[in-house]
Amino acid sequence: NEGSEREENVEKEGLCNACAWRQNTRYSRIEAIKIQILSKLRLETAPNISKDAIRQLLPRAPPLRELIDQYDVQRDDSSDGSLEDDDYHATTETIITMPTESDFLMQADGKPKCCFFKFSSKIQYNKVVKAQLWIYLRPVKTPTTVFVQILRLIKPMKDGTRYTGIRSLKLDMSPGTGIWQSIDVKTVLQNWLKQPESNLGIEIKALDENGHDLAVTFPGPGEDGLNPFLEVKVTDTPKRSRRDFGLDCDEHSTESRCCRYPLTVDFEAFGWDWIIAPKRYKANYCSGECEFVFLQKYPHTHLVHQANPRGSAGPCCTPTKMSPINMLYFNGKEQIIYGKIPAMVVDRCGCS
Amino acid sequence: NEGSEREENVEKEGLCNACAWRQNTRYSRIEAIKIQILSKLRLETAPNISKDAIRQLLPRAPPLRELIDQYDVQRDDSSDGSLEDDDYHATTETIITMPTESDFLMQADGKPKCCFFKFSSKIQYNKVVKAQLWIYLRPVKTPTTVFVQILRLIKPMKDGTRYTGIRSLKLDMSPGTGIWQSIDVKTVLQNWLKQPESNLGIEIKALDENGHDLAVTFPGPGEDGLNPFLEVKVTDTPKRSRRDFGLDCDEHSTESRCCRYPLTVDFEAFGWDWIIAPKRYKANYCSGECEFVFLQKYPHTHLVHQANPRGSAGPCCTPTKMSPINMLYFNGKEQIIYGKIPAMVVDRCGCS
């Protein structure tokens, strides 16, 4: 009985030490944040500006309203605990897709016609920023005007219509080399992604004044690499499960391992009225112990540690992902600045 | 003599250990990078694609050329050793500037006239993306057409001309509330920044059909916050000296402290033809010992360590800044992807 009591006391003392340590860490982090903000804004001291002066100087105008309104909805890290931005996987920026064969696009002689594009799921779930169809026009012998048409195949209508227009343009071509021409197909691509069954393919025409088609749709001899293709630019903000990430704890947690703890910095609390917005923000901090292969920032860190003859100190609990905050503030010269301050929020803690 | 020989041997052994450790670290880092690339690209294995297939599939087209050309000039970290992007200080995005008084802008009775804008060096050295002059037009009682004129003061010319037009516009105002109107003044602002002596101020007129000026240039009672102001959007990529950063070493270095070491990853060397570009890149790695307050990532880390009752392990040598690489590759589905792979280059090492 005595033994278990002693054990309990030791445990309490351990928790108490952890609490005191976290308390110290919190205090240090707040002081450091104050120093950091002034230093990052290149201010020697906090601008001396009263609430009245702010009321007087602050334009009651749309651009200011917009900036301040961003802060009305406080960014809450835990709004969706299961998913967050994936800063590990590659972000796709451009996808170049070649045409493939399709049953819909057949000529009378059974040969495939150009062009059908299949889309990977990579495009499906991304916001298309730009989509260009690139076509190569064969060289001409004399100056000529070329009419380019990009047609979209549709299911034949009652009246027999099989096409609808995507884009058309007029080009003046001079003798010499062939040219690559790009055509904006963003809208049609977005429709295809929304309704994949509507993607039956496209037809490309580039007729000169005499009706000759200059577009390379199926490369002839010496025309390798001159196929039409789609260049799609996407913004890719993939999400991944928070399971892959560091631990999140709260102040009452008994977790001894490396963990992220909440910490809200309140500018009003320390009289920084010169910061117009936000009035407070979630900064967070890291605290806890690291074992060798626990929560390492880079997947290979444990390999390095395994091979580490001088690595006795081991990894340490540190922010592995930080994000900026946007701030609207007076700089003491009757100017209002809206800017981004890097690395002010701890998003994740890990051992590295 | 024997003592100094023993000492020399110990030192050699220490260096040898350090070499072996670094060799291990290098090897681990390369293996880890290979695993990372496949994992970050969500590929289970390296795509099996021959050089011939690549030659055939690769469009000989401008967008591909552009992407590949980026890699012809290999990014060399040491191209400018003294300056690099500043990821510490705040980046300014929007500056809102209020009018100040000026000697040039005086009315006959000696009262100041609106408007003179002083510009901080923050704008001087940044590229202006957008500059809007915002003016508030007092409410009208009946529907009216308003002619807005923004004039720029110039040094009086021989013929007495003191103004030149910046912008004029016609507005239809309905009874009710006053309105904020923005006017594009980017060109004139850029000129002022190039030749500050030409900035003598502006005059604002907003005359209704009866010749009444509706523009608030000096706020009357209840018109606080309705002053004209300039909203300037800038792109801000400040540089700071590399002195603030971590140490850089080479393979022959005897440095024992936390340091960044060079490491080039050569994709061709391990037969990864599916990566179109780059063929090789500088990955770098971190190695070395950490004292308590040496090279810490965040200015306040030492505060935290000072207060750390369980911090005996101390900080460790880890990447404190990593950057992505852009990669052009085949994904094995006849698609060429251009994307960004996060955290593949160690830019800086520090103790955190």
């Epitope: 048409q149 219509t161 096409y163 227009g165 995507i166 343009l169 007029k170 025409k205 | -």
Partner: antibody
């Protein structure tokens, strides 16, 4: 409501130059996104496109007439004109000026090669 | 150049009947086809462009269809004012060409 009116001599001698003017009323030629065409119709026959001119002075001519045709725009007079050199009896026709259709949207630019407002036409006879 | 062939040359119908006019291109012109109506002593009037788009003010009884080389203009129920000559025009190439016309006359 935009209206077009052709004017010029009704009779031109062979080998001379045929000059026609089209006056635009009911709208300013310089503030519209349109291009302006000339079409002709020989007696009892179908229509033949001659060419068009836009505000920038850029022209497109029927290749069969290209060597003999010149078109221009005079925004100050709200007019555009046609000149055909070295005329022969084969150039006898009713000449129409027309406004190109303003394209539905930026997507299908080639629609501007159709004509949605026409003048009532002027007869030109080439004879000595 | 692209040759446009219209058929029939003459179509004799009564008011209220359905008229179907055909236009064939010597090669594919995609959807770059327009239809015009011309009455004696008058200038042509644009009816349809882009195969099936009605020009401003054109009644719904006029409709166009087709793509590639074969195109049709349909007048669902002939009104007295519809008796005229109808021309198709291709603009698939920069050398714009018209068909020879189809005359729709009262039977």
């Amino acid at each position: 409501q935009v209206q077009l009116q052709e004017s010029g001599p009704g009779l031109v001698k062979p080998s001379q130059t045929l000059s026609l003017t089209c006056t635009v009323s009911g709208g300013s030629i310089s503030s519209s996104p349109y291009s302006w065409s000339w079409i002709r119709q020989p007696p009892g026959k179908g229509l033949e496109w001659i060419g068009y001119v836009d505000l920038a002075g850029s022209t497109d001519y029927n290749p069969s007439l290209k060597s003999r045709v010149t078109m221009s725009v005079d925004t100050s007079k709200n007019q555009f004109s046609l000149k055909v050199n070295s005329v022969t009896a084969a150039d006898t026709a009713v000449y129409y000026c027309a406004r190109a259709l303003s394209s539905r949207s930026s997507e299908w630019l080639l629609d501007q090669y159709t004509m949605d407002v026409w003048g009532q036409g002027t007869t030109v006879t080439v004879s000595s | 150049e692209i040759v446009m062939t219209q058929s029939p040359a003459t179509l004799s119908l009564s008011p209220g009947e359905r008229a179907t006019l055909s236009c064939r291109a010597s090669q594919s012109i995609g959807i770059n086809l327009a239809w015009y109506q011309q009455k004696p002593g008058q200038a042509p009037r644009l009816l349809i462009y882009g195969v099936s788009n009605r020009a401003t003010g054109i009644p719904a009884r006029f409709s166009g269809s087709g793509s590639g080389t074969d195109f049709t203009l349909t007048i669902s129920s002939l009104e007295p004012e519809d008796f005229a000559v109808y021309y198709c025009q291709q603009y698939g190439t920069a050398r714009l060409t018209f068909g020879g016309g189809t005359k729709v006359e009262i039977k």
